[in-house]
């Protein structure tokens, strides 16, 4: 999780801090949203269960040219133990359901805030 504190991070970031920073970035995205996020791009919905960080990254990595979520993509990669590339899909995707990136971020944010409150950081 070293990378989650930013590239100049002096050392490993505690998991709770990494999760808080991811949440704060998602809050930033939702609050600073003027036009439709990522031009209204659609992504696969995911099951918010174990392994959801990789699933979330797999969904969002397919959105290209959207600077608003680039930091989120980087942060999610720090939570995902394997390398994720575009076109990759896990069983956690609800493959028949696509939602707008804005809704995806909102759902993910809500879930992550609850994980933080319950002390579930991994």
């Amino acid at each position: 999780l070293t990378c989650l504190g930013g590239f100049a991070s002096p050392g490993p970031v505690p998991p709770s801090t990494a999760l808080r920073e991811l949440i704060e970035e998602l809050v930033n995205i939702t609050q600073n949203q003027k036009a439709p996020l990522c031009n209204g791009s659609m992504v696969w919905s995911i099951n918010l269960t174990a392994g959801m960080y990789c699933a979330a990254l797999e969904s969002l990595i397919n959105v290209s040219g959207c600077s608003a979520i680039e930091k989120t993509q980087r942060m999610l990669s720090g939570f995902c133990p394997h390398k994720v590339s575009a076109g990759q899909f896990s069983s956690l995707h609800v493959r028949d359901t696509k939602i707008e990136v804005a809704q995806f971020v909102k759902d993910l944010l809500l879930h992550l805030k609850k994980l933080f409150r319950e002390g579930q950081f991994n």
Epitope: S16, T17, L19, R20, L48, L110, H111, K113, K114, F116, R117, E118, G119, F121
Partner: antibody, heavy 120, light 112 residues
Amino acid sequence: EVQLVESGGGLVQPGGSLRLSCAASGFNIKDTYIHWVRQAPGKGLEWVARIDPANDNIKYDPKFQGRFTISRDNAKNSLYLQMNSLRAEDTAVYYCARSEENWYDFFDYWGQGTLVTVSS
Amino acid sequence: DIQMTQSPSSLSASVGDRVTITCRSSQSIVHSNGNTYLEWYQQKPGKAPKLLIYKVSNRFSGVPSRFSGSGSGTDFTLTISSLQPEDFATYYCFQGSHIPYTFGGGTKVEIK
């Protein structure tokens, strides 16, 4: 405007059952946690249980586990507390309360409470 | 379970007095996320509780500045710097860090 309204209280005999309701308005219950807190007459506050209506993640005070069941109906934006095998010591005002919606740090809204009296 | 012990259980005071209520937890209430979920609620007869202080020392919106909270680890304090007529009520501390969450026994502040 955020509101929580409890109902379903009343007089019940020892060993009986009662189902309390908490109707929420002004917010979506899936966005937060809802708790039940009770207060016996002239006594202090006692936390009973909590539910995450988004995924049915439920926590109880162990002393109520097995007798009390918390549930929700997201379509009705409502919460319930099913109370079985009631005892005289369960006589109390029962409140539902919600955790605030940003970081779930505290209870920001409470209902007015509903009185449950267990007596023969 | 974590016991929250409040003292005193009741006190008599006059308008303008400085009032201090203490709350001691039977073990640390620092959550694994680093926060200390220690709250203070005020309750008047026949009414639902109202939040005053959250996370030890943060005043809830609309709460007068005469109310303040402090402490760490297992020892916490609610201070009312200058008691007002509307402050006569019962005060409860609450820990929301470890399940089952628990309230203190309450402190009733009465008019001297």
